[in-house]
């Protein structure tokens, strides 16, 4: 008799172990479900208070007609430049006409002056051809003044309200490029 | 953290054609840009294209013409389609994923062109 309700004192010990590992587990669970739910509601938060706040272009950016554009404050050679864009979420600038290459340089004689800024273009080594970072053409009137004197690749630049040319390697400013954000409004 | 993953790779004649993929898994919402670079052997690795969430595309010259990346409508697969393929385009080929903060690396698949 004293062996059977010992034995059932220790089936109860175990149960009671179970349960309290159980509870133990749920209380885990609901902080993590809380933690979770706490970060969700910041996510939420932080998306709609950005959509709400939601303006064409990011801080630091520029806008004119659809495009936004961002005009460094770092020197780098052309390829980092890329990709120094390209982590924004952009490429290097694509000057489409007369009207956006004169937008640009006015938008930098305000900012900082008369200095060289990269942009996506590059001379192919084979045909000499300049195209844009896309594969288009340049239209006529934006290919560059000048033909680098460089036997290494030749990039596209702007300075003042001229564009230019010369090895890629060489250190400059650069200006990004991106769609601007069409309003739902 | 970002998972990439590529696919397509193989052996192709020259004046042939391959489609590599490039899928993306884990905090993909981070991602801004993607890209293709290849590395052959005793050389640096180069970017071969890249395109932005917006779509915006960039080709290296050597490139241009030949070569054309596109991803899928919800962003998480990046192509390259590859065309007239040449010897000098024989390398390791890299998926690579741009975060403002960070760059994310895929392990590479091989493309050599001979006959």
């Known amino acids: 008799k004293l062996l059977q309700v010992s034995t059932i004192a220790m089936q109860q010990q175990e149960k009671l172990i179970q349960q309290e590992r159980a509870l133990l587990n749920f209380t885990e669970w609901k902080r993590s479900c809380a933690l979770q739910m706490k970060y969700c509601q910041a996510f939420m938060q932080n998306s709609l208070s950005s959509a709400h706040n939601s303006s064409p272009c990011p801080n630091n950016w520029i806008q004119n007609r659809e495009s936004c554009y961002y005009v460094s404050e770092i020197w780098s050679i052309w390829h980092t430049s890329q990709e120094n864009c390209l982590k924004e979420g952009s490429t290097l600038l694509q000057i489409e006409s007369k009207e956006e290459m004169d937008f640009i340089t006015g938008s930098l004689r305000k900012i900082k002056g008369s200095y060289d800024y990269w942009v996506g273009l590059s001379q192919d080594g084979h045909s000499g051809r300049w195209l844009w970072q896309d594969g288009s053409s340049p239209s006529p009137g934006l290919l560059p003044a000048e033909r680098s004197q460089s036997a290494n690749q030749v990039c596209g630049y702007v300075k003042s309200n001229s564009l230019l040319s010369s090895n890629c390697s060489t250190w400059k400013y650069f200006i990004c490029e991106k769609y601007a954000l069409r309003s739902s409004v | 953290q970002v998972q990439l993953q590529e696919s397509g790779g193989g052996l192709v004649q020259p004046g042939g054609s391959l489609r590599l993929s490039c899928a993306a898994s884990?905090?993909?919402?981070?991602?801004?840009?993607m890209g293709w670079y290849r590395q052959a052997p005793g050389k640096q690795r180069e970017l071969v294209a890249a395109?932005?969430?917006?779509?915006?595309?960039t080709y290296a010259d050597s490139v241009k013409g030949r070569f054309t990346i596109s991803r899928d409508g919800a962003g998480n697969t990046v192509y390259l389609q590859m065309d007239n393929l040449r010897p000098e385009d024989t390398a390791v080929y890299y998926c690579?994923?741009?975060?403002?903060?960070?760059?994310?690396w895929g392990q590479g698949t091989q493309v050599t062109v001979s006959s």
């Open positions: 690579k994923a741009f975060t403002r903060t960070y760059d994310y």
């Open positions: 884990g905090r993909i919402s981070s991602i801004n840009s």
């Open positions: 395109i932005t969430n917006g779509g915006a595309k």
